[in-house]
Interface confidence: medium
């Protein structure tokens, strides 16, 4: 019962759901399910039967390995997939794959919330805007990463002449993609170009 594999893939890609071990020899039947009650395909030692489902036409079963190929996965395909095998001995076994489909992150837009010249220092507040996604943020000043504690959607920092950077980059990433947005300043403390 303890077979649970997590997979994260990018939307639009083709995915292979398979198990890391060999299938039981000469099994009698193999079924792939989507969530609990949606049969995708069933193989019963003679032929594969594909069920009416949202996967019809974009899945293929390899009875040899038990692998299920799904083309052009979308976020709606997020779920736990279950492969159930009936062995010749009568025992049954199952494997579960929790599939997470993520969209590639969009290119972020950097908004200058505040930029203020303060006695040779530059107070800077930048926000990195992308439409409602759960992502990680990394800020760079002239390609050098800012400390970890400053890594969220807003960068707020006071720059002194000795650590003044010209360009600021926000990198947004999820587990399948990453994109950058950059703004550059003209010394001492004005927006140059985006």
């Amino acid at each position: 019962q303890g077979h649970l594999v997590h997979m994260t893939v990018v939307s639009g890609s083709n995915v292979t759901l398979n198990i890391s071990e060999s299938l039981p020899e000469n099994y009698k039947q193999l079924t792939w399910f989507y969530t609990f009650d949606q049969k995708i395909v069933e193989w019963d030692s003679r032929k594969s039967k594909y069920f009416e489902s949202k996967f019809k036409g974009r899945v293929r079963l390899d009875p040899q390995s038990g692998a299920l190929y799904i083309s052009k996965v979308q976020k709606e395909d997020n779920s736990t997939y279950i492969m159930r095998v009936l062995k010749k001995t009568g025992n049954e076994q199952e494997w579960k794959i929790k599939l997470q489909v993520l969209d590639p992150v969009p290119k972020p837009v950097i908004k200058i919330e505040k930029i203020e010249d303060m006695d040779d220092n530059c107070y800077l507040k930048l926000s990195c805007v992308i439409p409602g996604e759960s992502v990680n943020y990394t800020w760079y000043g002239d390609k050098r990463p800012f400390p970890k504690e400053l890594q969220n959607s807003v960068l707020e920092t006071t720059l002194m002449p000795h650590n003044y950077s010209r360009c600021y980059t926000c990198q947004v990433s999820n587990s399948v993609s990453s994109k950058n947005g950059t703004v550059c300043l003209s010394p001492p403390c004005t927006l140059a170009r985006s």
């Epitope: 019962q1 649970l4 736990t80 159930r84 025992n91 049954e92 929790k98």
Partner: antibody, heavy 117, light 107 residues
């Protein structure tokens, strides 16, 4: 040894709700399924629904759709089944069962629920 | 939904008798069938899964057979402790459905 421990007997008035708990002792629910099955006095077994605490998926029998809810607290390995708008026909023993997706190899002792005005 | 029909609804037999209970599914369920025994006031207990596989700890006098739509539970030599109600259940798909039960009484 793994056990499913259920909450105690309940007496409810028609229209009320009941919430029955099922705690796994000697085991956590991660990667397992819990089903709820009920049995009215002198009657057979009736499947109500299933929950997978690992990913939040639930399925309910059509008959109970709209008045049943299965939730869980993974930190205490407890699953809850709440049935609302109770009627006298809901008088039954409610069992949690499962740990196997395809059949029920482990059962709680059952929680008697009486619905009476 | 898949309908499960059990017969007989009750059977009375003597110790040592061979007892057979049948279960019919309204559609092909391959070998996806389980059998349970329930004693009064107790939760059901799994006897057989995948139509013919004996659950560990269950005496070998219990056996299951069948596939497709017709299934059988056999108690080869009835013992006094085998009284109770026996249920079949299809495990092919949701919703899970049970037969109406067969009550086994000892003469």
């Amino acid at each position: 040894q793994v056990q499913l421990v259920q909450s105690g007997a309940e007496v409810k008035k028609p229209g009320a709700s009941v919430k029955v708990s099922c705690k796994a002792s000697g085991h956590t629910f991660t990667n397992y399924y819990i089903h709820w099955v009920r049995q009215a006095p002198g009657q057979g077994l009736e499947w109500m629904g299933i929950t997978n605490p690992n990913d939040g998926n639930t399925r309910y029998a059509q008959k109970f759709q709209g008045r049943i809810s299965m939730t869980w607290d993974t930190s205490t390995s407890t699953v809850f089944m709440e049935l609302s708008s109770l009627k006298s026909e809901d008088t039954a023993v409610y069992y949690c069962a499962g740990l196997r997706y395809w059949f029920f190899d482990l059962w709680g002792r059952g929680t008697p629920v009486t619905v009476s005005s | 939904d898949i309908q499960m029909t059990q017969s007989p609804s009750s059977v009375s037999a003597s110790v040592g008798d061979r007892v057979t209970i049948t279960c019919r599914a309204s559609q092909d369920i391959s070998s996806w069938l389980a059998w349970y025994q329930q004693k009064p006031g107790k939760a059901p207990n799994l006897l057989i899964f995948a139509a013919s596989s004996l659950q560990s700890g269950v005496p070998s006098r219990f056996s299951g057979s069948g596939s497709g739509t017709d299934f059988t539970l056999t108690i080869s030599s009835l013992q006094p402790e085998d009284f109770g109600t026996y249920y079949c259940q299809q495990t092919d798909n949701f919703p899970r459905t049970f037969g109406q039960g067969t009550k086994v009484e000892i003469n």
